[in-house]
């Protein structure tokens, strides 16, 4: 079983602003799971809404 | 999907250049963007990278006086640029972006500084 | 992070098994890459993430890893396969690279 995603590289600690790299297989790139209250492709933008 | 990299460069010593990198098939802002430096008969080195998405750059403490990378994401392109040239930087430079299932490198661009 | 090839040479028949070796000084977490290279020519990316094969590359090539070490096989050695075979790791930067093994027909 592939999983869809991977724990980024160590040399990806920065790709994220505000949230957690991880790496998607089948894509074969990084993307970033925000933490609460933010949002954006590398959650660096504050959530006006939340 | 591929990088495609600008032309040879044959320039005099104490001169700057500036090599080119645009990709096709991907968007550059997904990943960062790296620069190798390859001089004859020898290994690779890592110059440095980009963050195409923001322009942030990291670069090997060797290359931090020497290189300067960009990247342009109209264009889909990073540029390395090269300054206060002397033999030493003669080489081939290449571009390259890696995945865990696919990579992708350019196929060179060869720096001669020469008088 | 440091990769090392113990061999920087070896010398080979056609036809054989060959298997070249990388070990790094740390884990990485097969964020690894090998590329095959001949004079006058770019690196060519055979393997990524350790054991895909990227598209094109002969089935006679694979890659394998256990822990820090890593191994390029290749099944049955072809003339064409006479190079400079070179591991990189990519798991943090700087991206370092072994000092290649070049492959010499006996």
């Known amino acids: 079983v592939v999983s869809h995603f991977n724990d980024c590289p160590d040399s990806h600690t920065q790709f994220c602003f505000h949230g957690t790299c991880r790496f998607l297989v089948q894509e074969d790139k990084p993307a970033c799971v925000c933490h609460s209250g933010y949002v954006g492709a590398r959650c660096e933008h504050a959530d006006l809404l939340a | 999907v591929q990088l495609q990299q600008s032309g040879a460069e044959l320039v005099r010593p104490g001169a700057s250049v500036k090599l080119s990198c645009t990709a096709s098939?991907?968007?550059?802002?997904?990943?960062?963007m790296h620069w190798m430096k390859q001089r004859p008969e020898q290994g690779l080195e890592w110059i440095g990278r980009?963050?195409?998405?923001?322009?942030?750059?990291k670069y090997a403490p060797k290359f931090q006086d020497k290189a300067t990378i960009t990247a342009d994401t109209s264009s889909n392109t990073a540029y390395l640029q090269l300054s206060s040239l002397t033999s030493e930087d003669t080489a081939v430079y290449y571009c390259?972006?890696?995945?865990?299932?696919?990579?992708?490198w350019g196929q060179g661009t060869t720096l001669t500084v020469s008088s | 992070i440091q990769m090392t090839q113990s061999s920087s040479s070896l010398s080979v028949s056609l036809g054989d098994r060959v298997t070249i070796t990388c070990k790094a000084s740390?884990?990485?977490?097969?964020?690894l890459a090998w590329y095959q290279q001949k004079p006058g020519n770019a690196p060519r990316l055979l393997i990524s993430g350790a054991t895909n094969l990227k598209t094109g590359v002969p089935s006679r090539f694979s890659g394998s890893a256990s822990g820090k070490d890593y191994t390029l096989s290749i099944t049955s050695l072809q003339t064409e396969d006479v190079a400079t075979y070179y591991c990189q790791q990519y798991w943090d930067t700087p991206w370092t690279f072994g000092g290649g093994t070049k492959l010499e027909i006996k």
């Open positions: 098939g991907f968007n550059i802002k997904d990943d960062y």
């Open positions: 980009i963050d195409p998405a923001n322009g942030n750059t």
């Open positions: 390259s972006r890696m995945g865990l299932l696919r990579g992708y």
């Open positions: 740390v884990h990485i977490n097969s964020w």
